[in-house]
Amino acid sequence: EVEKTACPSGKKAREIDESLIFYKKWELEACVDAALLATQMDRVNAIPFTYEQLDVLKHKLDELYPQGYPESVIQHLGYLFLKMSPEDIRKWNVTSLETLKALLEVNKGHEMSPQVATLIDRFVKGRGQLDKDTLDTLTAFYPGYLCSLSPEELSSVPPSSIWAVRPQDLDTCDPRQLDVLYPKARLAFQNMNGSEYFVKIQSFLGGAPTEDLKALSQQNVSMDLATFMKLRTDAVLPLTVAEVQKLLGPHVEGLKAEERHRPVRDWILRQRQDDLDTLGLGLQGGIPNGYLVLDLSMQEALS
């Protein structure tokens, strides 16, 4: 806490300029009017203040705006943003995407700090949903942003925003997140067809149901093994050998290298061995020839 001391004669700041870097902390406190600082925040960034001096400037703004800074000030905080605590930021009402961009720029190149996470949370909650422009902005600064959200938070992403998502934005998403994002992508890209559609949907396929995989198998998509290995096991299991062969196209040969890993291992166990043999890959572990496979759903219907 800086002590209240009178401003020395002739030192009263009339504007925010470089002369202030020579002021001691107590002089800044005494001689810089908080209202002046608020109206000239855009100049602060251009002046090489020390961290201690920035602390004083922050303190003056806190006194002027105890309920939280107005957006006109927030937009021009610049490096002073790094001095803010998550508690400070929770008092803000940030509605402009330009303000968000300006503050993210300050933190550019660094990991997402608790301050940035709080800022984004406040901004998204204020908007009510993660619209396309916001998602575009956030993934540009933090490619892993989408995958940092909980499935609950992802629920509020409108399908139209999915157009802003790039494959690398999904690299760190887990299956629970893809479960939420996939149907949104399906809705977003539903009017595309063929190879164009597959390029767009491919990174989301970890959330696809069996029915969509069956449909893709009819479209000559030639899914690569890396994508196939990320599919939900329960979605892959009901696929027939013929469907998997059509789905993978020339990549079907890669099944041999993955035969001990899920979902390939579990899928092999569900197939008749003679069906697997038609692939000519030497896949082993299928249901032996001559064994009867009971359709339990039929048994249930008859009982």
Partner: antibody, heavy 120, light 107 residues
Framework: EVKLVESGGGLVQPGGSLSLSCAAS????????MSWVRQPPGKALEWLGF??????????EYSASVKGRFTISRDNSQSILYLQMNALRAEDSATYYC???????????WGQGTSVTVSS | NIVMTQSPKSMSMSVGERVTLSCKAS??????VSWYQQKPEQSPKLLIH???NRYTGVPDRFTGSGSATDFTLTISSVQAEDLADYYC?????????FGSGTKLEIK
């Protein structure tokens, strides 16, 4: 405007057969999966099965309760969906709805329903 | 078969109140859950698909959320015309299945 209109319901004896029809209009019929759902009086909805679209070869899937007794088919030239019901039982009594499936396999359009009563 | 369990069986609310309906799946169904509204003597209507996506033309007081096994339909401010049965259904794997419904009555 999308419209689905069922017909063919009525009273039938146990063990008997009945064929329901659903006339579709207002959309490209061959692009969509079509489904049948039933609802016994005062009870919940039950999915019976669907028939896939042209791109997926018009193949079918059924629920265990009707597999082997009911058959779903479609006349794409006339945009009509059918449900052929054989070996009917008292528990098949219900209102039968024809539905269109959208991209997430939710039922986005429903017909008005047709009532089937199986009783001696 | 995947069992969809809805709760409560019925509820009575006043106009303007917030309503929360629950639906639990016996297995992970991703986000392949839809919510339907069936008014007395009418066919069901689709409200929400993909767990959280409002269907075209549905008022924004209806919101869906959840994934995997736990799903919720929220009506932020219930209106007299919302008197109906509400069903959840899964379309992740066949046989597709519905819950037994929640009857919403208006006081």
């Amino acid at each position: 405007e999308v419209k689905l209109v069922e017909s063919g319901g009525g009273l039938v004896q146990p063990g008997g057969s009945l064929s329901l029809s659903c006339a579709a209009s207002g959309f490209t019929f061959t692009d969509y999966y079509m489904s049948w759902v039933r609802q016994p009086p005062g009870k919940a909805l039950e999915w019976l099965g669907f028939i896939r679209n042209k791109a997926n070869g018009y193949t079918t899937e059924y629920s265990a309760s009707v597999k082997g007794r009911f058959t779903i088919s479609r006349d794409n030239s006339q945009s009509i969906l059918y449900l052929q019901m054989n070996a009917l039982r008292a528990e098949d009594s219900a209102t039968y709805y024809c539905t269109r499936l959208e991209v997430l396999y939710a039922m986005d359009y429903w017909g008005q329903g047709t009532s089937v009563t199986v009783s001696s | 078969n995947i069992v969809m369990t809805q709760s409560p069986k019925s509820m009575s609310m006043s106009v303007g109140e917030r309503v929360t309906l629950s639906c639990k799946a016996s297995e992970n169904v991703g986000s392949y859950v839809s919510w339907y509204q069936q008014k007395p003597e009418q066919s069901p209507k689709l409200l929400i698909h993909g767990a959280s996506n409002r269907y075209t033309g549905v008022p924004d007081r209806f919101t869906g959320s959840g994934s995997a096994t736990d799903f919720t339909l929220t009506i932020s401010s219930v209106q007299a015309e919302d008197l109906a049965d509400y069903y959840c259904g899964q379309s992740y794997s066949y046989p597709y299945t519905f819950g037994s419904g929640t009857k919403l009555e208006i006081k």
